[in-house]
Interface confidence: medium
């Protein structure tokens, strides 16, 4: 919005709320809110909440989503989690225990159940819970390849820490490969980094879910915290609607919320799903800070304006040198939601839902 | 711009051109075009053109700039190049020739001359010219640390190739450290990747600028192509203007330029600095494809509209659920320019100058 007329803030808020109503339904490809007749009483199952929290953590870790997104990424992603095959499985016997590596295997039938087609996969993350670490450790991730060779994927420098911390590796390409192939069990190896000079490196980092003499069988104690793949994929029934490529993208709230800025700024708006939209079908969260952009972006350049006066205003009011600058979102963040389809709870992430800052564009 | 009235395209273009006039001056923090009184006759010096081309290559390699940028990044960056200390320098004698590593040292006084304060450094890239490569090679980059130890920085998987190719490593943090410290010579090591299992890796890749029996002394033949640091920094005199953080960000042209789309789309606009702005002070390029966004973004949601009809339009016309969607740039690309300050030619990069695509926001 870019107007210097007196603005009816309430009208703008109502328009934004109604736009969000359409946005959420559109992202979920629903023509109307889903029926709640099949939803069982009581709280959400633990496993669903754990999944929702994983998704929320991912958002917190990443903050804004600066990357532009193809049309496929506009639509909500179904989030699923596939746990590592437990360490007592015979597959682990083939790989000798070593001081510098640990192995993680996954059942591809579980992956295929979650993501029936490779093209539907939007993102796959390998999540490992790192327990406390006494020394800095440089680790490398490898993918199991044909004839038991290993292919390097990525590395991470882990800082010493007294508290556990989730590690996340983007393994989208690898998981897409696995979904395309016929294998039953696929896996990763996490190794200490060895340089060509120093080759005596030991893997010092403890990853939850692996039996060691030092800790006892944490795999049993914390089964849900053993390594897992966090998958985000377009549900099969939504896939046929997707076309080739149309994009979207965008970035702060501290200044605007604490000032009386009249020009373009992010304005506070909390959407309560029940109160504002009359919706009861979204089980988590109860609402979210959607916010919106408002305020004029004066066109500040003309031949008869004194150059020096306007230059300082450029960065703020018309950084993109638009012919008619407009106050629009810059940083947008996603929103994970939990809702039911029939009796089945679903966790889905809606992209670009929360406006963190605005810009004149 | 978001309007469904008949649009005077020429007026919009003129407004955009005048806005660009201000934008460029503003990014350079100039109140008016710089005096050309001291500019010597004749073409630009070779070294300046080489630097300009390096900057252009960087842009081409990166394409769009998806990352949001703090205010500091809004302003033009001065681009400089610091060549590696030549291999016959005694510093190289301290590091034994090895089959798995090559060493690259830099004179920090040259770095400090280019970037007087660490905080001014915006980006530093280590550029290496890889000659033809027969086999896939996994390489690692290390930074020389105190007491001649080496700290791992990053890695790259190099595909076999018959033609030379520039490799670029982001070493901004490292160079910032070097600028903060008192050392005279600092360096990098490029090594073959050795895993803890296979330790017989040889560095197969040939980097231009290193003498080997196989190639003769290419350091002498191609001096300017030996490894270098490409630095982008805020000039000292511009630094005091910078405040904390205010951002900007955004993405395609193929569809719009080849269609008759009436709605929001990127429109073609080439700016010739001389013809359109009456400017002769920008020596390179002669002009650029600025483009601009134009076309309506209908507000497509209201309580009395049938839900199902509007859902399909959401992604296109109001993906951000704005109360008044607006046609704005999505992907923006930077523009390197060459101009004189007194007798001194400068290469600077202006961020977010080229509109590659638009979106309703």
């Amino acid at each position: 919005l870019s107007t210097s007329k007196t603005i009816d803030m309430e009208l703008v808020k109502r328009k934004r709320i109604e736009a969000i109503r359409g946005q959420i339904l559109s992202k979920l490809r629903l023509a109307s809110p889903p029926s709640q007749g099949e939803v069982p009483p009581g709280p959400l199952p633990e496993a669903v909440l754990a999944l929702y929290n994983s998704t929320r953590d991912r958002v917190a870790g990443e903050s804004a989503e600066p990357e532009p997104e193809p049309e496929a990424d506009y639509y909500a992603k179904e989030v699923t989690r596939v746990l590592m095959v437990e360490t007592h499985n015979e597959i682990y016997d083939k790989f000798k225990q070593s001081t510098h590596s640990i192995y993680m295997f996954f059942n591809t039938s579980e992956l295929r159940e979650a993501v029936p087609e490779p093209v539907l996969l939007s993102r796959a993350e390998l999540r490992l819970l790192r327990l406390k670490l006494k020394v800095e450790q440089h680790v490398e991730l490898y993918q199991k390849y044909s004839n038991n060779s290993w292919r390097y994927l990525s590395n991470r420098l882990l800082a010493p820490s007294d508290s556990p911390e989730w590690l996340s590796f983007d393994v989208t390409g690898v998981v897409r490969q696995w979904l395309s192939r016929g294998g039953e069990i696929e896996g990763f190896r996490l190794s200490a980094h060895c340089s060509c000079d120093s080759r005596d490196n030991t893997l010092q980092v403890d990853i939850n879910g692996f039996t060691t003499g030092r800790r006892g069988d944490l795999a049993t104690i914390h089964g849900m915290n053993r390594p897992f793949l966090l998958l985000m994929a377009t549900p099969l029934e939504r896939a046929q609607h997707l076309q080739s490529s149309r994009h979207r993208a965008a970035l702060d709230t501290n200044y605007c919320f604490s000032s009386t800025e009249k020009n373009c700024c992010v304005r506070q708006l909390y959407i309560d799903f029940r109160k504002d939209l009359g919706w009861k079908w979204i089980h988590e969260p109860k609402g979210y800070h959607a916010n919106f952009c408002l305020g004029p972006c004066p066109y500040i350049w003309s031949l008869d304006t004194q150059y020096s006066k306007v230059l300082a205003l450029y960065n703020q009011h018309n950084p993109g040198a638009s012919a008619a600058p407009c106050c629009v979102p810059q940083a947008l963040e996603p929103l994970p939601i939990v809702y039911y389809v029939g009796r089945k709870p679903k966790v889905e992430q809606l992209s670009n839902m929360i406006v963190r800052s605005c810009k004149c564009s | 711009l978001s309007t469904s009235k008949t649009i005077d395209m020429e007026l919009v273009k003129r407004k955009r051109i005048e806005a660009i006039r201000g934008q460029i001056l503003s990014k350079l923090r100039l109140a008016s075009p710089p005096s050309q009184g001291e500019v010597p006759p004749g073409p630009l010096p070779e070294a300046v053109l080489a630097l300009y081309n390096s900057t252009r290559d960087r842009v081409a390699g990166e394409s769009a700039e998806p990352e949001p940028e703090p205010e500091a990044d809004y302003y033009a960056k001065e681009v400089t190049r610091v060549l590696m200390v030549e291999t016959h320098n005694e510093i190289y004698d301290k590091f034994k020739q090895s089959t798995h590593s090559i060493y690259m040292f830099f004179n920090t006084s040259e770095l400090r001359e280019a970037v007087p304060e660490p905080v001014l450094l915006s980006r530093a890239e280590l550029r290496l010219l890889r000659l033809k490569l027969k086999v896939e090679q996994h390489v690692e980059l290390y930074q020389k640390y105190s007491n001649n130890s080496w700290r791992y920085l990053s890695n790259r998987l190099l595909a076999p190739s018959d033609s030379p190719e520039w490799l670029s490593f982001d070493v901004t943090g490292v160079v910032r450290q070097w600028l903060s410290r008192g050392g005279e010579i600092e360096g990098f090591r490029l090594s073959a990747h050795c895993s803890c299992d296979s330790r017989d890796n040889t560095l197969q890749v040939d980097i231009n600028g290193f003498t080997t029996g196989r190639r003769g002394d290419l350091a002498t033949i191609h001096g300017m192509n030996r490894p270098f640091l490409l630095l982008m920094a805020t000039p000292l005199e511009r630094a005091q203007h910078l405040q904390s953080s205010r951002h900007r960000a955004a993405l395609d042209t193929n569809y719009c330029f080849s269609s008759t789309e009436k709605n929001c789309c990127v429109r073609q606009l080439y700016i010739d600095f001389r013809k359109d702005l009456g400017w002769k002070w920008i020596h390179e390029p002669k002009g650029y494809h600025a483009n601009f966004c134009l076309g309506p973004c209908p507000y497509i949601w209201s309580l009395d509209t049938q839900y199902s009809k509007v859902l399909a339009l959401y992604n296109q016309h109001n993906p951000g659920a704005s109360a008044a969607p607006c046609c704005v740039p999505q992907a923006l690309e930077p523009l390197p320019i060459v101009y004189y300050v007194g007798r001194k030619p400068k290469v600077e990069q202006l961020s977010n100058m080229i509109v590659r695509s638009c979106k309703c926001s």
Epitope: - | S35, Q36, G37, V39, P41, G42, K280, H283
Partner: antibody, heavy 119, light 107 residues
Amino acid sequence: EVQLLESGGGLVQPGGSLRLSCAASGFTFADYAMTWVRQAPGKGLEWVSAISGSGAATYFADSVKGRFTISRDNSKNTLYLQMNSLRAEDTAVYYCARVSSGHWDFDYWGQGTLVTVSS
Amino acid sequence: DIQLTQSPSSLSASVGDRVTITCRASQSISSYLNWYQQKPGKAPKLLIYAASNLQSGVPSRFSGSGSGTDFTLTISSLQPEDFATYYCQQTYTVPLTFGGGTKVEIK
């Protein structure tokens, strides 16, 4: 409006000296390099000399090098050409012109002043 | 020094004619070439700078092209006020040099 007005021309004997002036107005004089171009009667244009905006850099044609000096007084918005050891072949209309940019095109010219070297 | 050779040295044409004047440099000068018009008893006037850029206020019937060593000045439809002498100038290196000129006369 940009204006350039040359003065100081006239008749001089071979070996003599002459100082040409060019008074500039209508623009920020110090922001522009300036140049002198001459034209012998019935002949084409010949570039003589040029000077940068501050006066720090000067340029000369080989035919006048060592004999002519170019200077400027930015406080007076004036360009000068001091001509010594004049020869018959220096006879020409002398124009001062403004150098418009780093491309060195001459966008504004004075009306010229005639210098005749003859005994 | 860089020599500029203009051709023809003179030409006769009628009002409305399309006129082309060429300028050849003794070595490559990129696009460092300007064109000037001079009428008898007057100072030269800049028409085209940097080989192909029309100077402000100059009619659009004038155009310049070329790069390297070969350049062209074209008057698309000759007008009575266009009868004059035209000079090319290189600014690639010092000494700056002018071509010998092309006199456009009324046929």
